[in-house]
Amino acid sequence: AVNGTSRFTCFYNSRANISCVWSQDGALQDTSCQVHAWPDRRRWNQTCELLPVSQASWACNLILGTPDSQKLTAVDIVTLRVMCREGVRWRMMAIQDFKPFENLRLMAPISLQVVHVETHRCNISWKISQASHYFERHLEFEARTLSPGHTWEEAPLMTLKQKQEWICLETLTPDTQYEFQVRVKPLQGEFTTWSPWSQPLAFRTKPAALGKDT
């Protein structure tokens, strides 16, 4: 960042998207600002328009290509600049040399589905979206289940330390409504962070059979 009150944070989704947030105390809300991306060894560059997300922060997505195309590699470095219009000229507000695969945040897992449900357990699967083939199996997941009367924040986290795109939830209560979420993170990258949580999957356990001990 150019000065102490400015914060410029970006993440690469490992394929064709860099998402950036820029925050600056005292910046004018109606100022027109952009993020410019200049890779060190590619023929293309890209720009996106920063749009306000709160009183003093703006966000935008640099779309580098089709969603599943590998637009940057492990050795690319991208110069990212925040440029704001001041009258007829542009002023640089922030700059960083961005190593894409040190700053990863994958897309949220998709296609959550109940594979099998019983009275006390439920098997759920999902898929990862727009994740680079670079990772092979070196991904980890966190999952959580929302029980009746609790909040997501209270839900204990379950960690899957390998690329396992399913989970068997145990010790559930019969005939009860639950919700389930999962998120993903590569092992690679010093500043890599968890993906957003997936859309919640709602499911209901089977009722206990009458007159039977379950």
Epitope: T73, A74, V75, H133, Y134
Partner: antibody, heavy 117, light 107 residues
Framework: EVQLVQSGAEVKKPGATVKISCKVS????????IHWVQQAPGKGLEWMGW????????EYAPGFQDRVTITADTSTDTAYMELSSLRSEDTAVYYC??????????WGQGTTVTVSS | EIVMTQSPATLSVSPGERATLSCRAS??????LHWYQQKPGQAPRLLII???QSISGIPARFSGSRSGTEFTLTISSLQSEDFAVYFC?????????FGQGTKLEIK
């Protein structure tokens, strides 16, 4: 089972070119990276470069980029490494390996190249 | 280019004892450090990734740790099959580079 099987030992004269093959099985070659590593007696392990079969891109280490060419034939699941203008210091074992860009998960058995006049 | 320095060059340890191998990077490499084992006449085998993450199928006696630019591979109780050469490798800056190796021999 993941396997990388390399071509046999080669003896070459200085100034010649060598081309080594690496036939893979047990994984999807089209969505993989294949790397090449040199292990010379006095120099240890040196990463030469890789080919990304999905993106169709190659990356070469500066110390090799003038003389090395890495290619792949996705119809036969085979990668190739060609090293030109051979000199005696190129006498080494050459390995192909599979991995993400950052480390090498599976290795071929190695191909010995001897450069001698 | 980042230089990886391994120490000692040779380490003599008795079976059943603990072995500690060191690898130092010439500049900060975060946790981008990986360990391999190589036996005579064989290709290297990946043991540990990102400083401390074990690869599946590798015995639990192998563990890794990091302190700044210094990385350590520990083998808690040496088995006869563990005597080999161990290499570290950085993946922070291209070209990725290996250490010169530590030969672990039977005392």
């Amino acid at each position: 089972e993941v396997q990388l099987v390399q071509s046999g030992a080669e003896v070459k004269k200085p100034g010649a070119t060598v081309k080594i093959s690496c036939k893979v099985s047990g994984f999807n070659f089209k969505y993989s990276l294949i790397h090449w590593v040199q292990q010379a007696p006095g120099k240890g392990l040196e990463w030469m470069g890789w080919i990304d079969n999905e993106a169709g891109e190659t990356e070469y280490a500066p110390g090799f980029q003038d003389r090395v060419t890495i290619t792949a034939d996705t119809s036969t699941d085979t990668a190739y490494m060609e090293l030109s203008s051979l000199r005696s210091e190129d006498t080494a074992v050459y390995y192909c390996a599979r991995g993400g860009p950052w480390f090498l998960s599976y290795w071929g058995q190695g191909t010995t190249v001897t450069v001698s006049s | 280019e980042i230089v990886m320095t391994q120490s000692p060059a040779t380490l003599s340890v008795s079976p059943g004892e603990r072995a500690t191998l060191s690898c130092r990077a010439s500049q900060i490499i975060s946790n981008n450090l990986h360990w391999y084992q190589q036996k005579p006449g064989q290709a290297p085998r990946l043991l540990i990734i990102y400083g401390l993450q074990s690869i599946s199928g590798i015995p639990a006696r192998f563990s890794g740790s990091r302190s700044g630019t210094e990385f350590t591979l520990t083998i808690s109780s040496l088995q006869s099959e563990d005597f080999a050469v161990y290499f570290c490798q950085q993946s922070n800056n291209w070209p990725y580079t290996f250490g010169q190796g530590t030969k672990l021999e039977i005392k």
